[in-house]
Interface confidence: low
């Protein structure tokens, strides 16, 4: 079957839209009237209250939309709505760093139904966004390359559909944990893929299989750059007990949403934080997350590391290839940004069994203490570890070393760090030295060699 609409054209239930393994049921999308796609415009001039706009000259001219700015569309996913706080929060953070037309796309008329139907309704949403982009181009000469579409879950595939319909001329699409069911393993026509925009970046946060794990997000790479924070499956802070999950710092409603789909929602929270942390989400090219956690992918290569989230488009190699995979760790609550360091400690003093910790002090801030090694501490041995600091310490000025005994030792041995090398993710090294040794639980300050 096929159904046609005056503005948006025709929609069929033929393969690959239906009747394939991933979507066996022949279902058509609802009508544009029923999906009721709305465009809610926030700008730097109206950051708190949206203006509802339409693909119409008088509507745009009568709004705060400015043609000399970039336009970022944000599309929500299944069951969600365009007035939800998270979309406006993305806009508000954008206004801290740029002048922009920020359009939250509401399609709750089509998202609050069964999942299979909603997965078809995104075709209408994508067509509506494409129509809007093409209208801006024809009416105002506004280039699609100045458009960025950000989509969460099903919204990521709606963004892909908008990009496909505008022949890949949209400047950028960001997929925030694109939905897995009915999309993973489907032909590119159906789902978000790198041909949908000049640049497609993706954040995967809930990549466990839908059966039996209820992972809503895709594990499949679908962009030019695909980021897998914390491995892309289980996000830190999402394994809280039910009560603490629901009684969330952001309120009961956000806590309830988190309880239902914490990993899946983390993607937009990371993106929101990335806007105000231009270097806090460096993604490391790596074979897998296991290799990354084994400390085999540090520092960034000579071409640099892309930033997951808002600043991914600054990566020089962003469109060198498709399916480039990057790994990183984040925090367990906002602020999610982290800065990775490698610390190598050369020991001095007595041979003991214990563990050593180091804290960093720089011109931008100071870190907590991080464990570098646990085991036999032998003089002249060197131990290295990588850790993710919640503070960007900047240029290192000094480090502090402390050690703890694993067993009671009546001889009160002294241990020191003759040299500590700190390496930042861009490969910049800072060397610190001290001839001193200290008893356990005593801080030793090392200064530049």
């Amino acid at each position: 079957k096929e159904v046609c609409y005056e503005r948006l054209g025709c929609f069929s239930d033929d393969s690959p839209w239906s009747g394939i393994t991933e979507r066996p049921l022949h279902i058509l999308p609802w009508s544009p009237k029923d999906v009721n796609t709305r465009f809610l415009l926030y700008t730097n001039e109206n950051p708190n209250n949206f203006q509802e706009v339409a693909a119409d000259s008088s509507s745009i001219s009568g709004s705060n939309f400015k043609t000399n700015r970039k336009t970022r569309f944000i599309i929500h996913g299944f069951i969600d709505k365009g007035e939800e706080n998270w979309l406006a929060n993305v806009c508000k953070n954008l206004f801290k760093v740029e002048s922009v037309n920020c359009i939250c796309v509401d399609w709750k008329g089509g998202s609050r139904t069964g999942y299979t139907q909603a997965s078809q309704n995104i075709r209408i949403v994508g067509a509506e966004v494409a129509y809007f982009v093409e209208f801006l181009q024809s009416a105002f000469g506004y280039s699609p390359s100045n458009v960025h579409v950000i989509g969460h879950s099903l919204g990521a595939h709606a963004a892909g559909e908008a990009g496909r319909r505008t022949n890949g001329t949209i400047g950028r699409i960001t997929g925030l944990d694109p939905a897995e069911p009915c999309f993973q393993g489907t032909p590119e026509l159906v789902r978000l893929d790198p041909s949908d925009a000049k640049f497609v970046d993706v954040i995967h946060t809930d990549g466990a299989p839908i059966v039996p794990n209820l992972g809503f997000g895709m594990s499949q790479v679908v962009g030019h750059l695909d980021f897998f924070p914390n491995g892309g499956v289980e996000m830190p802070g999402c394994k809280k007990n039910i009560l603490s999950q629901i009684v969330d710092i952001d309120g009961i409603w956000e806590g309830t949403r988190d309880f239902a789909a914490c990993n899946h929602l983390r993607s937009y929270k990371y993106y929101t934080d990335s806007i105000v942390n231009p270097d806090g989400f460096a993604g490391f090219p790596c074979a897998s997350y296991n290799v990354f956690t084994a400390n085999k992918c540090f520092p960034c290569p000579s071409g640099g590391c892309p930033q997951m989230g808002h600043y991914a488009d600054r990566y020089p190699g962003k469109t060198n290839d498709v399916g480039q995979k990057f790994y990183l760790d984040t925090g367990d609550a906002s602020n999610f940004a982290r800065w990775r360091y490698k610390v190598s400690v050369t020991l001095s003093g007595k041979k003991v069994t214990g563990h050593i910790l180091v804290s960093l002090f720089g011109n931008k801030g100071n870190s907590k203490q991080y464990e570098i090694f646990k085991g036999t501490l032998k003089p002249d041995s060197t131990h290295s570890n990588e850790f993710d600091s919640d503070v960007d310490v900047g240029d290192l000025q000094m480090v502090k070393f402390i050690w703890y005994n694993n067993v009671i030792n009546p001889t009160l041995p002294r241990v020191g760090a003759s040299k500590i090398i700190v390496e930042t993710n861009v490969g910049k090294q800072f060397n610190f030295c001290s001839p001193e040794t200290v008893r356990e639980e005593v801080l030793l300050t090392l200064t530049p060699c």
């Epitope: 801290k96 760093v97 740029e98 105000v276 231009p278 270097d279 640099g304 900047g394 240029d395 910049k428």
Partner: nanobody
Framework: QVQLQESGGGLVQAGGSLRLSCAAS????????MGWYRQTPGTERDVVAT???????NYADSVKGRFTISRDNILNTVYLQMNSLKPEDTAVYHC???????????????WGQGTLVTVSS
Amino acid sequence: QVQLQESGGGLVQAGGSLRLSCAASGSIGSIHTMGWYRQTPGTERDVVATIQDGGSTNYADSVKGRFTISRDNILNTVYLQMNSLKPEDTAVYHCNADVRPYRTSRYLELWGQGTLVTVSS
């Protein structure tokens, strides 16, 4: 008010050289990444080169070996030395910087107005 001001653009023959400068002025706490982007009519703004506060540099493939980015952290200035220029390098070159204004905790993304570089064949 923190702002960026570019200079150094102009007309040059293919094979020639130009040096662009971009100075950040105002009440600056610190500057993280600085960079140069270029744009031709009807296209998106593309990264040319970036340099982080630690000195780490990145270049677009099309300019590697020909362009050199550098910065002076005392003068809060970034430079782009462009050698062996080609007609396809013709564009408006925009300076970009992540600037944290004095006594604030957030970095702001700032753009310069742009300077036109024309390479004639």
